[in-house]
């Protein structure tokens, strides 16, 4: 039985040209995390594998940085980065857990962050 839950940064906003950290956290399970895939609207952004480490998709190499931890840092944000992001935790023996984050990239200087994780 899958007992785990994923906490995420939820709905977040950031300024155009700035950067943002996408974070998910799997809790309430003793399952081993074997891999975390970060996806954006049917595109692979990055993968963090317990054995192989990080793989960043070539098309995002200039704007995506691994970490902190299993999270992902998006840099040089544009309005086109607005949308849904998914962290997909592959675990053994539980299976797959998915978390969702909605990012809004704003033109203005007013941007609020989600409450679960504070972004410095």
């Amino acid at each position: 039985m899958m007992t785990g839950t994923i906490e995420t940064t939820g709905n977040i906003s950031a300024e155009k040209g700035g950067s943002i950290i996408l974070q998910c956290h799997l809790s309430s399970t003793t399952a081993q995390v074997t891999q975390v895939n970060w996806e954006q609207q049917d595109q692979l952004l990055a993968i963090c594998n317990a054995d192989l480490g990080w793989h960043i998709s070539p098309s995002f190499k200039d704007r995506v940085a691994p970490g902190p931890g299993l999270g992902l840092t998006l840099q040089s944000l544009t309005v086109n980065d607005t949308g849904e992001y998914f962290c997909i935790y592959h675990t053994y023996p539980d299976g797959t857990y998915t978390g969702r984050i909605f990012l809004e990239v704003l033109e203005s200087s007013v941007a609020e962050h989600g409450a679960r994780f504070q972004i410095p």
């Epitope: 595109q43 692979l44 054995d51 192989l52 998709s57 053994y92």
Partner: antibody, heavy 118, light 107 residues
Framework: EVQLLESGGGLVQPGGSLRLSCAAS????????MSWVRQAPGKGLEWVAD????????GYADSVKGRFTISRDNSKNTLYLQMNSLRAEDTAVYYC???????????WGQGTLVTVSS | DIQMTQSPSSLSASVGDRVTITCRAS??????LNWYQQKPGKAPKLLIY???SLQSGVPSRFSGSGSGTDFTLTISSLQPEDFATYYC?????????FGGGTKVEIK
């Protein structure tokens, strides 16, 4: 340099058995999932089985389930495919392939031919 | 099982031509689509992974696009060494499945 070298193919009668091996070198074998893929003469590619890095997760094609067994020995950097109850339709070149991140197959061996015939 | 349908099954083209091969999945597979090239008597070679990522060492004339159920492999300017058979493959779910292949021949 990444290398995958299959062996163990040959001619076998229907109902017989064979054990294929795939010797890996040039990378940390124990960190990668691995697959077997086959290709019948003049036909396309067919996935046969795969195994995760620690052998905790294994999958088979329906066509070989219950007859073939995939395994690995990380201390020997070797992947295996035990094939029992072989049929004429199992005749093919068998390739082993490395599967980084369980998403793609980036390196393939040269293949070993299995012929099932009486 | 997820069925992968490639089209065309074969095509004739000339050096310098732009070639497009399509692959359709029987259900949504997100970006879990890879493209391989195979020459007679040789093992397949990875060209494109995760729908649009170019494998290291593969010429930039190869590109991939698509998501969900419809995917495309494009060769922008066909070279003599590109005459081969091309396969798509889904890695979204087990059993992993391949398309039937597209043979690119010299016109």
């Amino acid at each position: 340099e990444v290398q995958l070298l299959e062996s163990g193919g040959g001619l076998v009668q229907p109902g017989g058995s064979l054990r294929l091996s795939c010797a890996a070198s040039g990378f940390t074998f124990s960190s990668y999932s691995m697959s077997w893929v086959r290709q019948a003469p003049g036909k396309g590619l067919e996935w046969v089985a795969d195994i995760s890095s620690s052998a905790s997760t294994i999958g088979y094609a329906d066509s070989v389930k219950g007859r073939f067994t995939i395994s690995r020995d990380n201390s020997k950097n070797t992947l295996y495919l035990q094939m029992n109850s072989l049929r004429a339709e199992d005749t093919a070149v068998y390739y082993c392939a490395r599967e980084p991140y369980d998403v793609w197959m980036d390196y393939w061996g040269q293949g070993t031919l299995v012929t099932v015939s009486s | 099982d997820i069925q992968m349908t490639q089209s065309p099954s074969s095509l004739s083209a000339s050096v310098g031509d732009r070639v497009t091969i399509t692959c359709r999945a029987s259900q949504s597979i997100s970006y879990y689509l890879n493209w391989y090239q195979q020459k007679p008597g040789k093992a397949p070679k990875l060209l494109i992974y995760a729908a649009s990522s170019l494998q290291s060492g593969v010429p930039s004339r190869f590109s991939g696009s698509g998501s969900g159920t419809d995917f495309t492999l494009t060769i922008s300017s066909l070279q003599p060494e590109d005459f081969a058979t091309y396969y798509c493959q889904q890695s979204y779910s087990t059993p992993l499945t391949f398309g039937g292949g597209t043979k690119v021949e010299i016109k």
